[in-house]
C-alpha cells in the first residue's frame, strides 16, 4: 500500500483540505470519491456538480482538493483510489464540528426569596459533538445536571442547576459557560440574580459621639434597615414599657432630650418588608452626671490631681465598659 490520506476535522462553514498522497508513483490514475462513492475528481478533472470542491494540487504523487463552506452533510469517508493492479484504496474521514447555534439561559423566577431553591436552565442548541455546560455563580463553579437530546446527528444539551439563594447572591451573575471543540475563547451567557430578603437592622448612636449617656444629656439613635425590597415600615418601640413622653420619633431616628434614670431600658427598632420583619435592640443606661471637684490647694496639687484623675478614669472607664455593647441585632 503506497496510498496515504489523513483524517480531517473542520468547523461547519469553514474549509476542509483532502489530500491523497502516493509514495513511489507510477503515474497511475488518482481518483477521489465522496462518501456516496461518487467521483469528485478523476485526475485533475471534476465531474461532480459541486463547485465547493476545488483542485489545490495535482501531480502523479498527490491529489489535493479543498472543500469550502463545509456542512454536516459533507461528513463521512472520502476515498482515494489508485488505478494500480491490484487497485489501491485509502480513505480519509471528514469530521464536521458544529458550534452550538444558540445559548439560552432561563431562570424559573425573575425574583427569588432568600432561602428559596430556584431552578436555572441553560440550553446549547444543535451542536456537534454535544456541548459541555459549566455553571458559575460569580467566580464560584457549581454543579449542574445535563441532559442530551440527539436529532439528525446534532445534539441539544440542557443543563439544570438547582440553586439555593442567599441575600449575598443578590446582583450576582449566574453564568452558563460552553465548552466545545468548535468554540475558541469563552462562549457564555449570564443572568443576574435578584434576591429578596428580610431587613437587616442596625442601630447607630449618632449622639452623644463618645457613646456615654448621662443624666441631662440628649440621645439620638438612627435605625438603619437594609432589605429587598427596601423596608416599608421602620418603627421604634420601648420593650416592656411606654416610650418616654419627651422622646421624639422622626422616621428612622429616635431623639430623647434631657435623659434621666427613668429612661433606662431597651429600645427596639423594627423594620419589615414583604419577605419578613427584623429588629435590633439598644439598651440604654443613663449614668450620673459628671462629679464637679473644686480646684485643689497648692500643697496637695499633685496628689489631688492624681487622685481626681484616677477617680475620673475609674468612673469613666467603668461607665464605658457598661455602655460599650448596648445594641443587639435580631
Amino acid at each position: 500500500q503506497n496510498l496515504f490520506t489523513k483524517d480531517v476535522t473542520v468547523i461547519e462553514g469553514e474549509v476542509a483540505t483532502i489530500s491523497c498522497q502516493v509514495n513511489k508513483s507510477d503515474d497511475s490514475v488518482i481518483q477521489l470519491l465522496n462518501p456516496n462513492r461518487q467521483t469528485i475528481y478523476f485526475r485533475d478533472f471534476r465531474p461532480l456538480k459541486d463547485s465547493r470542491f476545488q483542485l489545490l494540487n495535482f501531480s502523479s504523487s498527490e491529489l489535493k482538493v479543498s472543500l469550502t463552506n463545509v456542512s454536516i452533510s459533507d461528513e463521512g469517508r472520502y476515498f482515494c483510489q489508485l488505478y494500480t493492479d491490484p487497485p489501491q484504496e485509502s480513505y480519509t474521514t471528514i469530521t464536521v464540528l458544529v458550534p452550538p447555534r444558540n445559548l439560552m439561559i432561563d431562570i424559573q423566577k425573575d425574583t427569588a426569596v432568600e432561602g428559596e431553591e430556584i431552578e436555572v436552565n441553560c440550553t446549547a442548541m444543535a451542536s456537534k459533538p454535544a456541548t459541555t455546560i459549566r455553571w458559575f455563580k460569580g467566580n464560584t463553579e457549581l454543579k449542574g445536571k445535563s441532559e442530551v437530546e440527539e436529532w439528525s446527528d446534532m445534539y441539544t444539551v440542557t443543563s439544570q442547576l438547582m440553586l439555593k439563594v442567599h441575600k449575598e447572591d443578590d446582583g450576582v451573575p449566574v453564568i452558563c459557560q460552553v465548552e466545545h471543540p468548535a468554540v475558541t475563547g469563552n462562549l457564555q451567557t449570564q443572568r443576574y440574580l435578584e434576591v429578596q430578603y428580610k431587613p437587616q437592622v442596625h442601630i447607630q448612636m449618632t449622639y452623644p459621639l463618645q457613646g456615654l449617656t448621662r443624666e441631662g444629656d440628649a440621645l439620638e439613635l438612627t435605625c438603619e434597615a437594609i432589605g429587598k425590597p427596601q423596608p416599608v415600615m421602620v418603627t421604634w418601640v420601648r420593650v416592656d414599657d411606654e416610650m418616654p413622653q419627651h422622646a421624639v420619633l422622626s422616621g428612622p431616628n429616635l431623639f430623647i432630650n434631657n435623659l434621666n434614670k427613668t429612661d433606662n431600658g431597651t429600645y427596639r427598632c423594627e423594620a419589615s418588608n414583604i419577605v419578613g420583619k427584623a429588629h435590633s435592640d439598644y439598651m440604654l443606661y443613663v449614668y450620673d452626671p459628671p462629679t464637679t471637684i473644686p480646684p485643689p490647694t497648692t500643697t496637695t496639687t499633685t496628689t489631688t490631681t492624681t487622685t481626681t484623675t484616677i477617680l475620673t478614669i475609674i468612673t469613666d472607664s467603668r461607665a464605658g465598659e457598661e455602655g460599650s455593647i448596648r445594641a443587639v441585632d435580631h
Epitope: V29, R37, Q38, T39, F45, R46, P47, D85, P86, P87
Partner: antibody, heavy 111, light 108 residues
Framework: EVQLLESGGGLVQPGGSLRLSCAAS????????MSWVRQAPGKGLEWVSS????????SYADSVKGRFTISRDNSKNTLYLQMNSLRAEDTAVYYC?????????WGRGTL | QYELTQDPAVSVALGQTVRITCQGH??????ATWYQQKPGQAPVLVMY???NRPSGIPDRFSGSSSGNTASLTITGAQAEDEADYYC???????????FGGGTNLTVL
C-alpha cells in the same frame, strides 16, 4: 499522431466468438482507462465495457456481462475485447475510446 | 435501468441559437459530456465538465446544467453543425457509463 485503430471485426454466426483489438499510439497508453463503445446500424451509442489503466478493474454493461471480456496489454499498447456467445443484437460498429472520465479520443470503429 | 433522455430531433435556422437538452437522475450529481457524430464518422468530444470545450471546438458551443437537466447550446448554428449529438454520464457509482438516445440536429 495520437490515434486508436480497431481491428478484428467480421461476420460471425450466433453463438460464435470474436476478438477485437485496438492499437493505441501517440500517448502513454498505460496511464489511461480504455473503453469499448458500440453503435448498432441506425441506432445510438452504447457503452460496452471499461478497463482501468493498470488492468486492475473492469466494468461491463448489463447487456454483455458474462459474455464479453475486456483486457489490455500495456507493453503492446493494445486493448482487447473478447466476445463470446454472440447474438444478432450484438451487431454494431465497435469503437475503442480513450477515457479521461469523458471519451476524448475515439477510433474509427470496426464492424 | 439507468437512462438519459434526449429529444430525437431538433432543427434550427442557420445563424440562430439552438439548445439540445438531456435529462437523467445522475445529472443531479454529475456533469454531462457531449459528443458530435456526423454520418459515417466516429463521435467527437465537444463539451465536458461544467462548461469545457476541447481545443478545436468553436466557441459557439457552450454547456450548462440545472438540476437533472444538461444543455448544449449552439449560438449561431452553422451548416457544419448538422449532426447527431449524444449526451453521456455515469450511474452514481461512476462505474457504468450511459449515453442518451441522441438528438439529430438539422440546420435549415
Amino acid at each position: 499522431e495520437v490515434q486508436l485503430l480497431e481491428s478484428g471485426g467480421g461476420l460471425v454466426q450466433p453463438g460464435g466468438s470474436l476478438r477485437l483489438s485496438c492499437a493505441a499510439s501517440g500517448f502513454t497508453f498505460s496511464m489511461y482507462t480504455m473503453s469499448w463503445v458500440r453503435q448498432a446500424p441506425g441506432k445510438g451509442l452504447e457503452w460496452v465495457s471499461s478497463i482501468w489503466s493498470s488492468g486492475g478493474k473492469t466494468s461491463y454493461a448489463d447487456s454483455v456481462k458474462g459474455r464479453f471480456t475486456i483486457s489490455r496489454d500495456n507493453s503492446k499498447n493494445t486493448l482487447y475485447l473478447q466476445m463470446n456467445s454472440l447474438r444478432a443484437e450484438d451487431t454494431a460498429v465497435y469503437y475503442c475510446a480513450k477515457e479521461s472520465w469523458y471519451f476524448d479520443l475515439w477510433g474509427r470503429g470496426t464492424l | 435501468q439507468y437512462e438519459l433522455t434526449q429529444d430525437p430531433a431538433v432543427s434550427v435556422a442557420l445563424g440562430q441559437t439552438v439548445r439540445i437538452t438531456c435529462q437523467g437522475h445522475s445529472l443531479r450529481s454529475y456533469y454531462a459530456t457531449w459528443y458530435q457524430q456526423k454520418p459515417g464518422q466516429a463521435p467527437v468530444l465537444v463539451m465536458y465538465g461544467e462548461n469545457n470545450r476541447p481545443s478545436g471546438i468553436p466557441d459557439r458551443f457552450s454547456g450548462s446544467s440545472s438540476g437533472n437537466t444538461a444543455s448544449l447550446t449552439i449560438t449561431g448554428a452553422q451548416a457544419e453543425d448538422e449532426a447527431d449529438y449524444y449526451c453521456n454520464s455515469r450511474d452514481n457509482s461512476g462505474n457504468h457509463l450511459v449515453f442518451g438516445g441522441g438528438t439529430n440536429l438539422t440546420v435549415l
